[in-house]
């Protein structure tokens, strides 16, 4: 029966001190891990991999390196200036045999617009990806190649959550055996046909994504073909049956009252840690109302925060969240009005999310300002608008054509925004920097590994 199928990939997620520094608290970091895992879980569960369905993810264990671990010699991720390949290697030098995949989340600005890196799975041979066990490689080091890394920063800006979620799905896609999409069928965003182009590219597109187009969080047929072959061969090696919550992973799942991790991590006076006996672990201690592991509206003294306490900051598109006095969860924030400017006037709010382009405020569509002869490269990092479905009207917000809407003001894209038809990202100097999708691979080729390994790493 389906219920007995091995369809769950168990994850080990580590975060470095820079990720902690950006999000500020353990709870906020756990919320980020949870939202990333939920996002990829939804994507993979709703994809039919040639008959293999309901592929899901579960966090088996987390390790949060806080700013206190910045100087800890046992923390391999403590170094401030590490390139993306070295960062992945540090993850791979740990033994991850207990997990399907092991990831590190960071807040580092890697070179050339790289948002992630992962070893690519293959149906046969030992090459990396899902379920790969630790072994000795030709550089004399033992490595686990069931690994990947992602960062939430690009050219000095933080990427929107939807983009970060797709980055995670993309890197995990590599682990599951998918190379980058290529060919007209699997890169519709590069099509000359407007109808195809407007739906954008799929998850495994090699370059940039905005995360808001129809195909952006779907796998292409090319990816599905590759992933199904790897799942067919590898999932019985380490996937588990889904269903049971994992006490100790720091996330409160169905069947758990709370989850403050294992005894070495649990700083919570309210919750029994995962090393306690079966009947007690991940349960509230007697007389305690709540645990901070359940949400930000619970105090360290195990009581619900009062009605007026803030639990979420005001953002561009949503008002602050306020505790309601009878749950540990932070209630949903009220959205700001649709078409409120956000992301420094480059976008507008839609249903509480900074999702639409500023062009939409005036009934226009965003487009890429790029002349075929490449002469107007300086406009590639301008916000450009066009009349709906009419690319011949595409012009910068500062142009004569859109003066009545923008009063001659040139609105520039935020650093880290996709540009030139998703071929690159804008840097801080407003230059569109093309993504060299296989750059780290080329650099690794010159490094210490044996040649057969190089085939199997990708961004």
């Amino acid at each position: 029966t389906t219920s007995a199928e091995k369809n769950t990939c168990q994850l080990y997620i580590q975060t470095d001190h820079l990720f902690f520094k950006y999000y500020g608290t353990r709870e906020a970091v756990i919320a980020q891990i949870s939202s990333h895992v939920k996002a990829i879980d939804t994507i993979y569960q709703t994809t039919d991999f040639s008959g293999i369905r309901n592929i899901s993810f579960m966090v088996k264990r987390i390790r949060i390196n806080t700013t206190a671990d910045e100087k800890d010699p046992t923390n391999p991720f403590r170094f401030p200036n590490i390139g993306v390949e070295k960062f992945l290697e540090l993850n791979s030098e740990q033994n991850h045999d207990d997990y399907c995949l092991a990831y590190v989340f960071t807040d580092r600005d890697f070179d050339d617009g790289v948002l992630g890196l992962a070893w690519v799975g293959a149906p046969s041979g030992s090459s990396g990806g899902i379920c790969e066990k630790s072994k000795l490689y030709s550089d004399g080091k033992k490595k686990s190649l069931n690994t990947g890394i992602i960062t939430v920063q690009n050219y000095g800006s933080h990427v929107p959550p939807k983009v970060s979620h797709i980055t995670f799905a993309h890197e995990v896609g590599h682990n599951f055996g998918s190379p980058h999409d290529s060919g007209t069928e699997c890169t519709p965003g590069e099509s000359k046909n407007l109808g195809q182009k407007e739906n954008g590219n799929y998850i495994m597109y090699a370059r940039a994504t905005s995360g808001d187009k129809l195909n952006n969080n779907k796998f292409s047929l090319c990816s599905i073909r590759n992933i199904s072959q790897v799942l067919e061969k590898k999932r019985n090696n380490c996937f588990v049956e889904s269903g049971q919550p994992i006490c100790g992973n720091g996330m409160v799942e169905q069947g758990e009252e709370c989850d403050c991790g294992y005894s070495d991590q649990c700083k919570d006076e309210c919750c029994f840690d995962a090393n306690q006996p079966e009947g007690r672990k991940c349960k509230l201690k007697p007389g305690k109302q709540c645990s901070p592991s359940q949400g930000p509206c619970c105090t360290a003294q195990c009581a619900f925060k009062s009605k007026s306490e803030k639990c979420r900051d005001d953002s561009d598109c949503a008002r602050e969240g306020i505790c309601n006095g009878f749950t540990a969860l932070c209630p949903a924030s009220d959205p700001k009005p649709n078409f409120t400017d956000c992301n420094r006037h480059t976008q507008v709010c839609i249903n509480g999310q900074c999702a639409g382009s500023i062009c939409e405020k005036y009934g226009l569509e965003e487009c890429t300002c790029a002349s075929s002869d490449g002469k107007d490269d300086k406009e590639l990092c301008h916000v450009c608008c066009m009349k709906k479905m009419d690319p011949s009207t595409c012009a910068s917000t500062g142009s004569v054509q859109w003066s009545r809407h923008f009063s001659g003001r040139t609105i520039t894209l935020q650093p880290g925004s996709p540009c030139n038809d998703f071929r690159g990202y804008c840097d801080v100097f407003m230059r569109c920097r093309l993504v060299d999708a296989d750059g780290p691979l080329a650099r690794l080729k010159k490094a210490i590994f044996s040649p057969e390994l190089y085939e199997n790493i990708a961004e």
Epitope: A395, S399, T410
Partner: nanobody, 119 residues
Framework: EVQLVESGGGLVQAGDSLRLSCAAS????????MGWFRQAPGKEREFVAH????????EYADSVKGRFTITRDNAGNTVYLQMNSLKPEDTGVYCC????????????WGQGTQVTVSS
């Protein structure tokens, strides 16, 4: 290089008219789109009107439509803004601007002329 100099501003009563001029130096005046913008104290710059190379096409901000008229004299290298039925909210510094094409940014800007409409 195009240099733009505005004139014709002043202090008027609500309901009065004014005609602003913008003189352009350079022989290529007729190959530039011309526009007028204004900026009230403490506010962002606001589009008023623009006119195509030949003068055949014009566009106006909703707030001035029917009251203001933009015209150009290519022989005299000048663009005009005729402002009728002026209102206190029309007060501001009026600047003219030039651009080589519809899809290009406004490349050249004048210093501006002050228009004050009292009630």
């Amino acid at each position: 290089e195009v240099q733009l100099v505005e004139s014709g501003g002043g202090l008027v009563q609500a309901g009065d008219s004014l005609r602003l001029s913008c003189a352009a130096s350079g022989r290529t005046f007729s190959s530039y789109y011309m526009g007028w913008f204004r900026q009230a104290p403490g506010k962002e710059r606001e589009f008023v009107a623009h006119i195509s190379l030949s003068g055949g096409n014009t566009e106006y901000a909703d707030s001035v439509k029917g009251r203001f008229t933009i015209t150009r004299d290519n022989a005299g290298n000048t663009v005009y803004l005729q402002m009728n039925s002026l209102k206190p909210e029309d007060t501001g510094v009026y600047c003219c601007a030039a651009s080589p094409s519809l899809r290009s940014a406004w490349q050249y800007w004048g210093q501006g002329t002050q228009v004050t409409v009292s009630s």
